[in-house]
């Protein structure tokens, strides 16, 4: 496989990562597809200074990030620990909130105005952003 | 200039296989995924399978999901369409084509090759 | 996966027409919306891209507008040359493409 060493045209640098920032929005299993065509993953949060990156570039928008319970737990989507790992969900959220009206819970994670997380209905059009981490070994398969 | 090129249609029989070839030029082909789109005789166009940069992520439409199978070869800048299980409705000319994307989050193709027609009959 | 509605599925014109097709997709797609011309035994090209923004060497003529589920490509003069089949496409969601308008000379 390749290696990426530097970020692609349009992608922000931080940490030995690339990030990119949408500027519309999309359902978080559609805005995931996207990332991963770029090959990357939606946002992955592992530390507060990460947190305050990210928020600083997102501004006070709804913002999709790379964890989901839609297979009951709660899972990042690049395999990171959820339950050891770093979390900033907003005063008494997630609560897979079913009054919606739009049908099932909440099982999708944003960030919220204030940067904090909320969990929501996967198909709300929100903004998202990709990371992708440098360094890494692309692992183009073989081709058969 | 960014120049696509198919080649591998012809006839095949029903239950068949074929693999189809996209060469690329004039670009920097591991940095942009890539797509296949067909189009029946007299026909709109379907959109078929798409391929990240470096090969890792695939995604294909529900009605050739199984069947055939996108992979590209970044060093020789070559993308694949290997097309197994081959009905009658799979007979179209079929396109490879570029992903551009813009700032925001919207994303098209361009260019397009000039096709080569798959023909599935017995 | 969403449905793109195109109309109408043909029209006549003469040259110098002011031509508007539309494109209705089946839920909100924002303006996530593609629009190619295709020449008969020839690929696609685009014209319009993300709803309005004209694509790099194409005629001023073409244009995109609309939002949502409401879009139109407008030709403001028909040329010879436009004579021919135009699809919308939408990249919101897995991609799908329009039934196509077929412009013919009347």
């Known amino acids: 496989g390749s290696e990426r060493t530097c970020c692609p045209v349009n992608w922000v640098e931080h940490e030995r990562s690339c990030y990119w920032f949408s500027r519309s929005g999309k359902a978080w299993a559609d805005a995931d597809n996207y990332c991963r065509l770029e090959d990357a993953h939606l946002v992955v949060v592992t530390s507060w200074e990460e947190q305050k990156f990210v928020q600083h570039h997102i501004g006070p928008v709804n913002t999709w990030m790379g964890l989901h319970d839609q297979n009951g737990p709660w899972k990042w989507v690049d395999g990171t620990d959820y339950e050891t790992g770093f979390k900033n969900w907003r005063p008494e959220q997630p609560d897979d909130w079913y009054g919606h009206g739009l049908g099932g819970g909440e099982d999708c994670a944003h960030f919220t105005d204030d940067g904090r997380w909320n969990d929501d209905v996967c198909q709300r059009p929100y903004r998202w952003v990709c990371e992708t981490e440098l360094d890494k070994a692309s692992q183009e398969p073989p081709l058969l | 200039e960014v120049q696509l090129l198919e080649s591998g249609g012809g006839l095949v029989q029903p239950g068949g296989s074929l693999r189809l070839s996209c060469a690329a030029s004039?670009?920097?082909?591991?940095?942009?995924?890539m797509n296949w789109v067909r189009q029946a005789p007299g026909k709109g166009l379907e959109w078929v399978s798409a391929?990240?940069?470096?090969?890792?992520?695939?995604f294909y439409a529900d009605s050739v999901k199984g069947r055939f199978t996108i992979s590209r070869d970044n060093s020789k800048n070559t993308l694949y369409l290997q097309m197994n299980s081959l009905r009658a409705e799979d007979t179209a000319v079929y396109y490879c084509?570029?992903?551009?994307?813009?700032?925001?989050?919207?994303?098209?193709?361009?260019?397009w090759g000039q096709g080569t027609l798959v023909t599935v009959s017995s | 996966d969403i449905q793109m509605t195109q109309s109408p599925s043909s029209l006549s014109a003469s040259v110098g027409d002011r031509v508007t097709i539309t494109c209705r997709a089946s839920?909100?797609?924002?303006?996530?919306l593609n629009w190619y011309q295709q020449k008969p035994g020839k690929a696609p090209k685009v014209l319009i891209y993300?709803?309005?923004s004209l694509q790099s060497g194409v005629p001023s003529r073409f244009s995109g507008s609309g939002s949502g589920t409401d879009f139109t490509l407008t030709i403001s003069s028909l040329q010879p040359e436009d004579f021919t089949t135009y699809y919308c496409?939408?990249?919101?969601?897995?991609?799908?493409f329009g039934g196509g308008t077929k412009v013919e000379i009347e």
């Open positions: 084509a570029k992903r551009v994307t813009d700032y925001g989050g919207n994303d098209w193709f361009d260019p």
């Open positions: 004039g670009f920097t082909f591991s940095s942009y995924a």
């Open positions: 391929i990240s940069g470096s090969g890792g992520n695939t």
């Open positions: 839920q909100s797609i924002i303006n996530y």
């Open positions: 993300t709803a309005s």
């Open positions: 496409q939408q990249s919101y969601s897995t991609p799908t």
